[in-house]
Amino acid sequence: VEVQVSEDPVVALVDTDATLRCSFSPEPGFSLAQLNLIWQLTDTKQLVHSFTEGRDQGSAYSNRTALFPDLLVQGNASLRLQRVRVTDEGSYTCFVSIQDFDSAAVSLQVAAPYSKPSMTLEPNKDLRPGNMVTITCSSYQGYPEAEVFWKDGQGVPLTGNVTTSQMANERGLFDVHSVLRVVLGANGTYSCLVRNPVLQQDAHGSVTITGQPLTF
């Protein structure tokens, strides 16, 4: 028996369902009574889901996995993972045994989009050219950790005096705070771009300083 999986990682958004595809080619006359199917975590060998002795043995993984029972006889051994979370990320191995056995691993990459950045300014009034200001760009509840880029109004990257910190909640979703310290010109626009490296999703925020008032 030959097992086939997708070579590209499966990218799944947090709290959505993901399908880890695995298939085999059943011989003529194949019946489910002959099938032993095991899904396990590749690194730790922890059992995730199994089908043995002609029946679905159920989820061994937080009760969030399911097979496609009606499609098994056609050679579809895919695994459905429900309500994906950060800790599901990793490699899963699909073992299929009929008379002989084969296995293959599929990688799951988890992602969550970052929110549109909010911009704050300190100080936020009585600003004059030559003043040092602190601009903070904050974006929330994303995964994995973000990349943050600052640019001025002409699109020139601002790299000096930038401090970026990230903290995560109990689910592993990150909040990112990036602080730019800059000396004000006569007027100017400062943009922050928060990039999710897996989704290649960019979230933009900007602040324009033209004396008063401020524009966000």
Epitope: Q46, S62, T87, Q141, M167, A168, N169, E170, G172
Partner: antibody, heavy 114, light 110 residues
Framework: EVQLLESGGGLVQPGGSLRLSCAAS????????MSWVRQAPGKGLEWVAG???????YYADSVKGRFTISRDNSKNTLYLQMNSLRAEDTATYYC????????WGQGTTVTVSS | QSVLTQPPSASGTPGQRVTISCSGS????????VHWYQQLPGTAPKLLIY???RRPPGVPDRFSGSKSGTSASLAISGLQSEDEANYYC???????????FGGGTKLTVL
């Protein structure tokens, strides 16, 4: 500076009610999950309740149906309404940022006694 | 009795390496992230390790966290007298749908 300041603790009789408040400053309160944790005298930590930034709520079994967590984002304040109080609710109550509490308040003491 | 089991006490001498365990199930530690807290005598707890193995800013690299299966561990190397405190593990529990703390471990530096 990120700060959390609890208030509202005190002495209350069994069956009584109390409302705890937690004033948050130094961060964008509305964007954060928040929670309450308590510690009975000489005992360990017990997570009491949590509220997501979107206001979905979660409770420990021990307080379900008696305690209500809520938030007022316009006031940057987290609340814990405690009803039908029992002697075993006597504890120091801490509020914290996130469910995994990366920032803690200093705590407020609740004593339930007749 | 806590769903997350920690030894009530642990001890070590200055400079030693000490490990504190936290045992759970597939519904909590097995499929969720683990967090560790330090509570010095008479003070509020503080976050020591988050996301199983990450240190918040300001926490010395003498403290490290790990997880295997349904158990997690906090390791403290180069033990110092100021490490004497109570240590708690915590994680989400899928069956209870709530966040949980372990019972705590009192660490004594001899």
């Amino acid at each position: 500076e990120v700060q959390l300041l609890e208030s509202g603790g005190g002495l209350v009789q069994p069956g009584g009610s109390l409302r705890l408040s937690c004033a948050a400053s130094g961060f964008s309160f509305s964007n954060y999950d928040m929670s309450w944790v308590r510690q009975a005298p000489g005992k360990g930590l017990e997570w009491v309740a949590g509220i997501r930034s979107g206001s979905r709520t979660y409770y420990a079994d021990s307080v379900k149906g008696r305690f209500t967590i809520s938030r007022d984002n316009s006031k940057n304040t987290l609340y814990l309404q405690m009803n039908s109080l029992r002697a075993e609710d006597t504890a120091t109550y801490y509020c914290g940022r996130y469910f995994n509490m990366d920032v803690w308040g200093q705590g407020t003491t609740v004593t339930v006694s007749s | 009795q806590s769903v997350l089991t920690q030894p009530p006490s642990a001890s070590g001498t200055p400079g030693q390496r000490v490990t504190i365990s936290c045992s759970g199930s597939t519904f909590n530690i097995g499929t969720n992230l683990v967090h560790w807290y330090q509570q010095l005598p008479g003070t509020a707890p503080k976050l020591l390790i988050y996301l199983t193995d990450r240190r918040p800013p300001g926490v010395p690299d003498r403290f490290s966290g790990s997880k295997s299966g349904t158990s997690a561990s906090l390791a403290i190397s180069g033990l110092q007298s100021e490490d004497e405190a109570n240590y708690y593990c915590a994680t989400w529990d899928d069956s209870l749908n709530s966040f949980l703390f372990g019972g705590g471990t009192k660490l004594t530096v001899l």
